[in-house]
C-alpha cells in the first residue's frame, strides 16, 4: 500500500488556446485530470487501473501551481494504491478548460481539452522527487512525482506491513526496509522477549521486563546464581538447591550441631583451656584462682587454702591474711618453730627431723595431707570428672559417677548406646543422637525386639487333601489334621491299598 504523488509546478499556455487551436473566451480557465495505470509500452486509453484524480481550476492560461499540501492537500496530488508497487507505471495528464463551474467530464464540450501528455517508465519507491517537463507546440507543463509507502508500509514495493508497538505482543519500531527494530531491552523475532539484567543466570533466572532477574525455585541472589540451601540449614552451603553441606566444625542434617564449640564460641574465660567434648559441649580447664563452668568467676583468695599448717585464712580488701597456730609463722604459716619433740604430726603422721633438729617434716598416712597431716585429702578438688560427671571421695581414692552416655575412669569416653547389644532376637541396633533404635527381624517387635509376634505358619496352606491346618504358637510351626483316608505330616499319602512291590 502506498501513494503515487504528483506535484504540478508550472503550466505555460501563452496564447491561451485549446488543443484545437481555438482560443478560450475570455481565457483558458485550466484544471487537470490525471490517470495512473499499469505500464504500457504504448500508453493507450482505457481504465486507469492505478487510480484517477482531478484538480479544481488552478489558473488561467499560464500559471505556477502553489504547493498546497498544508492547506487542502491538493498539491501534490495523491493517488493511493492498495497493492504491491510494481515498480513501473503509465501516467496521463490532461489539461482542460472549464467554461463554467461544472468540471464533470460529461458537462464539458469535447473540444475543451487544452493538452494531453502521456509518459511511462520505471519508478522505485523513495522520498526523492523526479522532475519532468513536457512540451507541446503550444503548451509546456513542469511537474515532479514520486511513490512513497503509506503509513506502516515499508520495503521496495510497499508490501511489508509494519506497525510500531510497545505492548504485550511486541516492543519495536520499524526500519526503512520494514524489518523490526526492537526497543531497548527487548529481543526476539517480534521483540517480545525481555533482555534480563546483565549476568542473570540463563537457566536459573528469567525476567518479565527488561533489566530484571527473577529467580527460579531453589535459586537466589541478584543474578540468580546462588543456590538456596535446605530450609533451616544453619552452618552449611549448597552447590545445587536444597542441599546442606556442612561447614567445617558443624554436623547434622541442618549443620546446626556444633562439633567445634571451643573455636566457634570461645566460651572459656580468664585464659582457661577449652576442650570440645561432644556436640555443642565443651569443658573449660581453669587457671589457678578461677572457677565456674566457663572459669568466669574468681575464687576468693582464701578459697585456694593458702594457709599451711592449720592456719586460718581471712579475706581482706587487698588479698588475704593467715592466722597461724602456735608454733608457726610466715605469710602462709609455712615456717615452724616446732620440732619432732613437740609431736606436730596429726592423724598418725610420722615425724622426721631436718636441719639438725631445727625443722621437721611429717610423712602422712593415706587420706591425709598438709605440713602436719592436718588436712583430709579431698581428691575431688581438681574436678577430674569430664562431661558433667560427679566426683565422689572413696577413702584413699576417688571415683567419677558418669552422666548417661559417658564412661571411663573420668567419664571421658562417649558410650555408644548400641555397645551393650540392647536389641533382642537378632535385632539390628542404630545409634541416634538421643538414644538408639532397633530394627527387628521378622516375628519380633517392640522397642528392643523383645515382643514375639506370631507368624501364621498356615498362611502358605501346607496341608493337602483338605486337611485342617493349626499353628503351633510355641514353635511357629504348623500341624495338619488329616481327613479319613490320608496320612503323613502334610496328609499327602492315601491310606488303603498296600504299596505294590515289583517282585
Amino acid at each position: 500500500s502506498g501513494v503515487f504523488q504528483l506535484q504540478l509546478q508550472e503550466f505555460i499556455n501563452e496564447r491561451g488556446v485549446l488543443a484545437s487551436g481555438r482560443p478560450c473566451e475570455p481565457g483558458c480557465r485550466t484544471f487537470f485530470r490525471v490517470c495512473l495505470k499499469h505500464f504500457q509500452a504504448v500508453v493507450s486509453p482505457g481504465p486507469c487501473t492505478f487510480g484517477t484524480v482531478s484538480t479544481p481550476v488552478l489558473g488561467t492560461n499560464s500559471f505556477a501551481v502553489r504547493d498546497d499540501s498544508s492547506g487542502g492537500g491538493r498539491n501534490p496530488l495523491q493517488l493511493p494504491f492498495n497493492f504491491t508497487w510494481p515498480g513501473t507505471f503509465s501516467l496521463i495528464i490532461e489539461a482542460w478548460h472549464a467554461p463554467g463551474d461544472d468540471l464533470r467530464p460529461e458537462a464539458l464540450p469535447p473540444d475543451a481539452l487544452i493538452s494531453k501528455i502521456a509518459i511511462q517508465g520505471s519508478l522505485a519507491v523513495g522520498q526523492n522527487w523526479l522532475l519532468d517537463e513536457q512540451t507541446s507546440t503550444l503548451t509546456r507543463l513542469r511537474y515532479s512525482y514520486r511513490v512513497i509507502c503509506s503509513d506502516n508500509y515499508y520495503g521496495d514495493n510497499c508490501s511489508r506491513l509494519c506497525k510500531k508497538r510497545n505492548d504485550h505482543f511486541g516492543h519495536y519500531v520499524c526500519q526503512p526496509d520494514g524489518n523490526l527494530s526492537c526497543l531497548p531491552g527487548w529481543t526476539g523475532e517480534y521483540c517480545q522477549q525481555p533482555i534480563c539484567l546483565s549476568g542473570c543466570h540463563e537457566q536459573n533466572g528469567y525476567c518479565s521486563k527488561p533489566a530484571e532477574c527473577l529467580c527460579r525455585p531453589g535459586w537466589q541472589g541478584r543474578l540468580c546464581n546462588e543456590c538456596i540451601p535446605h530450609n533451616g540449614c544453619r552452618h552449611g552451603t549448597c552447590s545445587t538447591p536444597w542441599q546442606c553441606t556442612c561447614d567445617e566444625g558443624w554436623g547434622g542434617l541442618f549443620c546446626d550441631q556444633d562439633l567445634n564449640y571451643c573455636t566457634h564460641h570461645s566460651p572459656c574465660k580468664n585464659g582457661a583451656t577449652c576442650s570440645n567434648s561432644g556436640q555443642r559441649s565443651y569443658t573449660c580447664t581453669c587457671r589457678p584462682g578461677y572457677t565456674g563452668v566457663d572459669c568466669e568467676l574468681e575464687l576468693s583468695e582464701c578459697d585456694s587454702n593458702p594457709c599451711r599448717n592449720g592456719g586460718s585464712c581471712k579475706d581482706q580488701e587487698d588479698g588475704y591474711h593467715c592466722l597461724c597456730p602456735p608454733g608457726y609463722y610466715g605469710l602462709h604459716c609455712e615456717h615452724s618453730t616446732l620440732s619432732c619433740a613437740d609431736s606436730p604430726c596429726f592423724n598418725g603422721g610420722s615425724c622426721r627431723e631436718r636441719n639438725q633438729g631445727a625443722n621437721y617434716a611429717c610423712e602422712c598416712p593415706p587420706n591425709f595431707t598438709g605440713s602436719n597431716c592436718e588436712k583430709k585429702v579431698d581428691r575431688c578438688t581438681s574436678n577430674p570428672c569430664a562431661n558433667g560427671g560427679q566426683c565422689l571421695n572413696r577413702g584413699p581414692s576417688r571415683m567419677c559417677r558418669c552422666r548417661p552416655g559417658f564412661t571411663g575412669t573420668y567419664c571421658e569416653l562417649h558410650v555408644s548406646d548400641c555397645a551393650r547389644n540392647p536389641c533382642a532376637h537378632g535385632g539390628t541396633c542404630h545409634d541416634l543422637e538421643n538414644g538408639l533404635m532397633c530394627t527387628c527381624p521378622a516375628g519380633f517387635s517392640g522397642r528392643r525386639c523383645e515382643v514375639r509376634t506370631s507368624i501364621d505358619a498356615c498362611a502358605s496352606s501346607p496341608c493337602f487333601n483338605r486337611a485342617t491346618c493349626y499353628t503351633d504358637l510355641s514353635t511357629d510351626t504348623f500341624v495338619c489334621n488329616c481327613p479319613y483316608g490320608f496320612v503323613g505330616s502334610r496328609c499327602e499319602f492315601p491310606v488303603g491299598l498296600p504299596p505294590s512291590f515289583p517282585w
Epitope: 563452668v293 566457663d294 575464687l299 578459697d303 579475706d315
Partner: antibody, heavy 119, light 108 residues
Framework: QVQLQESGPGLVKPSQTLSLTCTVS??????????WTWIRQHPGRGLEWIGY???????HYNPSLKSRVTMSVDTSKNQFSLKMTSVTDADTAVYYC???????????WGRGTMVTVSS | DVVMTQSPGTLFLSPGERATLSCRAS???????LAWYQQKPGQAPRLLIY???SRATGIPDRFSGSGSGTDFTLNISRLEPEDFALYYC?????????FGQGTRLEIK
Amino acid sequence: QVQLQESGPGLVKPSQTLSLTCTVSSDSISSGNNYWTWIRQHPGRGLEWIGYIKYTGSAHYNPSLKSRVTMSVDTSKNQFSLKMTSVTDADTAVYYCARAPGSHSFDIWGRGTMVTVSS
Amino acid sequence: DVVMTQSPGTLFLSPGERATLSCRASQSVSSSYLAWYQQKPGQAPRLLIYGASSRATGIPDRFSGSGSGTDFTLNISRLEPEDFALYYCQQYSRSPITFGQGTRLEIK
C-alpha cells in the same frame, strides 16, 4: 519478651528433697551464652545465690550448698531444674529462677515460688 | 566469700530529692562486676545497673551507678513515688556470687 516461670510443690517435709522446675518461654535455653540460675530469698531477708547451669548440662554451685544441690537442663522442654536434698526449715524461702546473659547480672527473673519446709 | 555491706540500712527521703546508696565489698571486685537491683513487695528483683555503671534496658536515666574496687554507689537524681523500694547490690566477680543485705528507701 523472654519469660521465666517456676513450678513445683510449695510444701516439702524435712529431710526430703525439694524439686523445682523453671520453664523458659520466648527464648531457646540453648541459645546464647546464658547462665540459667537459681536464687533464693529467706522470709524478710536478703538474696542467696544457689548456683547455675548451662544448656550443656554443666553446673556451678554455691560451695555452701554444693553437697545438697543438683541442677539439670532439658533443652527439648526448654526447662531447667533444681533438686535440693535433706531440706530443713532453714531452706524455707522464695525460690527464683533467673537468666544471666554472658556474665552474672540477672536481667530476667521468674516471679518466684514460695517453698515451705514443714512436717 | 565476698561480703557486700550496704549503707544506710534505711533511707528516708521525699519525692524529688536525690538518693545516694552505698555498697562496700570485703574484697576488690574486678572489672566492675557489680549490679544493683530494685525489689518491691511481692515482686522479683529488677535489674537496674550492671557493670557498676551501665543502665539495664528500660531503666530511666535518673538511675546511675559509679565506683570501682570495693566502693560503689547508686544515685537516683530525682526520686519518683515509684522509686521507694528495697535496693540490693550484687558482686559477680568472685565465687560464690553474693548480694548485699539491702537498703530500704522510704518516703519521709
